[in-house]
C-alpha cells in the first residue's frame, strides 16, 4: 500500500499568475510557458548571465504546512548550458540554491535573506545546448529535497540564482500520509506521517456512516513513517436505525426500527406505529396517536384522553369548587392530569374572555392529579364558564380539537378589596396611631377593619388583632424601642378582604421623650 502525497503547493496547477516575490525585480521573471506535454504553465526564468556576482532571489507565497512535519520539495527545471550563450563564459553559472524560512504567518513582501535556511545547492543532471532548444522537452531535471521537522504554521521557499540561465518549470511541495482505510466499521483518515523516519502516529478512527464507537473501546491504529497502517485496536458498532453488513451499516427496512446501537438487529414496529422509510431509529405514530418525548421507542403510540366525566360545582360567594370523574378513555397512558380554563362571560351576547392572572386556584390550575379544584377571588355577581380538560403526556402533541367538560356559573357577593394608603400618624414609646383609606372595591358595606400587629423579630409566630369601625386607630400597650409590623383588612358581610402590605414601625426608646418618624423597612403583599 503506497504512501499518499498531499500537495501544499503545485505551481503547474495554477493557470493564473503565481505572483511570487522577485528580488531584485529585474531578476527572476514570471512567464507563460509549456511543460513537457505542451500544456500551458506558469514558469519563472532568469538568465542574468552577463554580469558577475548575481544574487537574484525568488520567494514563493507563504505555504501553510497544515499538519505536516516532514515536507518534500520537488523541483522540475531546465538549465541552459553556458556554452550555448555567446560571450558569457566568465559570468554564467549552472547551479542555483534552494532555501526555506519558517514562520507562523505571512510576513509580507520583503525577502530577508539572512533569515533563510539553505536546503541545498541544486545542479542540473542535464543542461541543454543551443541545439537542444529544438526539442520542446528541454532536458527537464527533477530534484526532490526534504525539510523538517517543522515547528511553525508555515514557511516560504526561496530560490537563489547566482548567474544561471534557468527556468523553474514546476515547484511541488507535499507531505506524506497513510491512506484512509476502513477497519472494524471505523474509518482511519489520511494521516500525516511523523516527524522522524522511525516514528509511529497513533490515530483514532472515525466510525463509518451510521456507526458509533463501542463504549470504552475506541478504534485506534498506528500510521508508520512509510505510510502504512499497523494492527487495529477497538471498534465501532452500527447506530440506531442501522445494522451491520460487511464494512458498512445498512438501514433497517420499512416497518422495522432499531432504537439503540447496543441492539444487534432491527425490530418490528410497536402497536399503533409504522416506519415507511429505511433507517428508522423509532417508528412514527399512526394518525391520532403520539409518542411523548420521554416515551422509549419500543412502547406503543398513545393518544390524548377523552373529556372528564360527571363535572359538578359548588358556589360560595366568589369561590367555586369543581369536582369530576376520570375520562372514559385515558388514551392508553397512565399519566393523566387535569387543567382548568376559566372564562368570564358577559350578560348580553354571551361572549367570554380568559379570566386573567388575579384568580386563585387550589391546589393549582394545571397539572392537577386529583379530580377537584377550588377557584377563588372571582368577581361578585359575574358569569363564568369553567372548562376541565383531561391531559396526558401526548395531549400537547395533538392538533385535534380539545376534549373537555364545561360548566357555567354566576358568583354571589364578594369580600372587599385590599385597604390602601396606610399611614403612621403618631409614634410614641408605647403607642402608634395609624390611618388608612377605604378599599377601592368595598363590594358591600364595610362593617369593621381588623388590624393585625406583631413584633417584627417574632416573625408572625404570635400576633395581636384590634378591630375598629373607623379608618384610623391607636394601638397601645406596645414595648418601647421595638419594631412592629402592622397590617389592616376590611370586613363585610361577604367576608374578609386581603391584608394591606406590611408596614414596619419602631416605637420610641424609653430614655428619650422625643418623637420621631419611623421608617418603613419593607412592604409586600400578604394574603389573608
Amino acid at each position: 500500500q503506497a504512501a499518499k502525497e498531499v500537495l501544499l503547493l503545485d505551481s503547474k496547477a495554477q493557470q493564473t499568475e503565481l505572483e511570487w516575490i522577485s528580488s531584485p525585480p529585474s531578476g527572476w521573471e514570471e512567464i507563460s510557458g509549456l511543460d513537457e506535454n505542451y500544456t500551458p504553465i506558469r514558469t519563472y526564468q532568469v538568465c542574468q548571465v552577463m554580469e558577475p556576482n548575481q544574487n537574484n532571489w525568488l520567494r514563493t507565497n507563504w505555504i501553510s504546512k497544515g499538519n505536516a512535519q516532514r515536507i518534500f520539495v520537488e523541483l522540475k527545471f531546465t538549465l541552459r548550458d553556458c556554452n550555448s550563450l555567446p560571450g558569457v563564459l566568465g559570468t554564467c553559472k549552472e547551479t542555483f540554491n534552494l532555501y526555506y524560512y519558517e514562520t507562523d504567518y505571512d510576513t509580507g513582501r520583503n525577502i530577508r535573506e539572512n533569515l533563510y535556511v539553505k536546503i541545498d545547492t541544486i545542479a542540473a543532471d542535464e543542461s541543454f545546448t543551443q541545439g537542444d532548444l529544438g526539442e520542446r522537452k528541454m532536458k527537464l531535471n527533477t530534484e526532490v529535497r526534504e525539510i523538517g521537522p517543522l515547528s511553525k504554521k508555515g514557511f516560504y521557499l526561496a530560490f537563489q540564482d547566482v548567474g544561471a540561465c534557468i527556468a523553474l518549470v514546476s515547484v511541488k511541495v507535499y507531505y506524506k500520509k497513510c491512506w484512509s482505510i476502513v477497519e472494524n466499521l471505523a474509518v482511519f483518515p489520511d494521516t500525516v506521517t511523523g516527524s522522524e523516519f522511525s516514528s509511529l502516529v497513533e490515530v483514532r478512527g472515525t466510525c463509518v456512516s451510521s456507526a458509533e464507537e463501542e463504549a470504552e473501546n475506541s478504534p485506534r491504529m498506528h500510521c508508520s513513517a512509510e505510510g502504512e497502517w499497523l494492527v487495529p485496536i477497538g471498534k465501532c458498532i452500527c447506530k440506531a436505525g442501522y445494522q451491520q453488513k460487511g464494512d458498512t451499516c445498512e438501514p433497517c427496512g420499512r416497518r422495522f426500527y432499531k432504537s439503540s446501537s447496543q441492539d444487534l438487529q432491527c425490530s418490528r414496529c410497536p402497536t399503533h406505529s409504522f416506519s415507511d422509510r429505511e433507517g428508522s431509529s423509532r417508528c412514527e405514530c399512526e394518525d391520532g396517536y403520539y409518542r411523548a418525548p420521554s416515551d422509549p421507542p419500543y412502547v406503543a403510540c398513545t393518544r390524548p384522553p377523552s373529556a372528564p366525566q360527571n363535572l359538578i360545582f359548588n358556589i360560595n360567594q366568589t369561590t367555586v369548587s369543581l369536582e369530576w370523574s376520570p375520562p372514559a378513555d385515558n388514551g392508553g397512558r397512565n399519566d393523566v392530569t387535569y387543567r382548568i380554563l376559566c372564562k368570564r362571560c358577559s350578560w348580553e351576547q354571551g361572549e367570554c374572555v380568559p379570566c386573567g392572572s388575579n384568580i386563585g386556584y387550589m391546589p393549582q390550575q394545571t397539572g392537577l392529579e386529583d379530580n377537584y379544584v377550588t377557584v377563588m377571588d372571582l368577581l361578585a355577581h359575574a358569569n363564568y364558564t369553567f372548562e376541565v380538560e383531561a391531559v396526558n403526556g401526548v395531549s400537547d402533541l395533538s392538533r385535534s380539537q380539545r376534549l373537555f367538560a364545561a360548566v357555567s356559573i354566576t358568583t354571589g357577593q364578594a369580600a372587599p378589596s385590599q385597604v390602601s394608603g396606610v399611614m403612621k400618624e403618631r409614634v410614641l414609646q408605647r403607642s402608634v396611631q395609624l390611618s388608612w383609606q377605604e378599599p377601592e372595591h368595598p363590594n358591600g358595606v364595610i362593617t369593621e377593619y381588623e388590624i393585625k400587629y406583631y413584633e417584627k423579630d417574632q416573625r408572625e409566630r404570635t400576633y395581636s388583632t384590634l378591630k375598629t369601625k373607623s379608618t384610623s386607630a391607636s394601638i397601645n400597650n406596645l414595648k418601647p424601642g421595638t419594631v412592629y409590623v402592622f397590617q389592616i383588612r376590611a370586613v363585610t358581610a361577604a367576608g374578609y378582604g386581603n391584608y394591606s402590605p406590611r408596614l414596619d414601625v419602631a416605637t420610641l426608646e424609653e430614655a428619650s421623650g422625643k418623637m420621631f418618624e419611623a421608617t418603613a423597612v419593607s412592604s409586600e403583599q400578604n394574603p389573608v
Epitope: S26, V49, M50, E51, V88, T91, L133, I166, A167
Partner: antibody
C-alpha cells in the same frame, strides 16, 4: 520604463565618419548585451553584430568588420556605433537593440527609434 | 552562413481572417528563432522568442511553432493594427534575419 534613445538623423559626405549614440535607461545597462541592426531604405533588416556591455567585447557580422566599431561608455549607459570611410551604400536607418537571453531562446526585446544616416556628396 | 527564407513575400488578408507566415532555414537552427513585427516608420518589435514564447504585452492571437528548419507564425484573427512586415531571425553563430513578409489588407 526601459528604453533606448538614439540621436537624430545625420547627413555625411562620403569618406567621413559618424558616431551614433544609443542611451539606455530603465534597467542595468551592463546586464544586457547590445546589438546593432541596419535597414537600408525599402529593404529588410540586417544584423551587424553585438557588444557585451559587461566586458566591452564586440562581435561583428560578416560584412561589418573594419569600418564599423562598437563601443561603450558605461558611466552614461550608452553604446556607440562608429562608421568610418562612409560610402553611399551605408545610407540606412541604424537601430540599437537590447539582447535578451532566456532559457527558451534569445531575441532583441527593446529597440531604439533608429538613426537615419544619409551619405551623399 | 545560415539563410532564412520567408514566404510569401506579401500576404493579403482581410481583418478577422487567419494569417500564416512561413520561415525556412537553410540548416537547422533549433528553436532559437524569434519573430519581429515592423510597421512603416517604426522600429521592429519582438513578437515571439524561442520559437513559441510570447513576451509580456503581446496579444495571444500571435502564436508560433516549429523547430529545426521549418517555422510558422500564425495570427489567428488579423486586426487592423496587425498590417505590417514580419521578420524571422536565427541565433546561430551569426545572427541573420529573413527578408520579411508583408501582411497587407486584401
Amino acid at each position: 520604463q526601459v528604453q533606448l534613445l538614439q540621436s537624430g538623423a545625420e547627413v555625411k559626405k562620403p569618406g567621413a565618419s559618424v558616431k551614433v549614440p544609443c542611451k539606455a535607461s530603465g534597467y542595468t545597462f551592463t546586464s544586457r548585451a547590445m546589438s546593432w541592426v541596419r535597414q537600408a531604405p525599402g529593404q529588410g533588416l540586417e544584423w551587424m553584430g553585438w557588444i557585451n556591455t559587461n566586458t566591452g567585447n564586440p562581435t561583428y557580422a560578416q560584412g561589418f568588420t573594419g569600418r564599423f566599431v562598437f563601443s561603450l561608455d558605461t558611466s552614461v549607459s550608452t553604446a556607440y556605433l562608429q562608421i568610418s570611410s562612409l560610402k553611399a551604400e551605408d545610407t540606412a536607418v541604424y537601430y540599437c537593440a537590447r539582447v535578451r537571453f532566456t532559457v527558451y531562446g534569445d531575441g532583441m526585446d527593446v529597440w531604439g527609434q533608429g538613426t537615419l544616416v544619409t551619405v551623399s556628396s | 552562413e545560415i539563410v532564412l527564407t520567408q514566404s510569401p513575400a506579401t500576404l493579403s488578408v482581410s481583418p478577422g481572417e487567419r494569417a500564416t507566415l512561413s520561415c525556412r532555414a537553410s540548416q537547422s537552427v533549433s528553436s532559437n528563432l524569434p519573430w519581429y513585427q515592423q510597421k512603416p516608420g517604426q522600429a521592429p518589435r519582438l513578437l515571439i522568442y524561442g520559437a513559441s514564447t510570447r513576451p509580456t504585452g503581446i496579444p495571444d492571437r500571435f502564436s508560433a511553432s516549429g523547430s529545426g528548419t521549418d517555422f510558422t507564425l500564425t495570427i489567428s484573427r488579423v486586426e487592423p493594427e496587425d498590417f505590417a512586415v514580419y521578420y524571422c531571425q536565427q541565433y546561430g553563430p551569426s545572427w541573420t534575419f529573413g527578408q520579411g513578409t508583408k501582411v497587407e489588407i486584401k
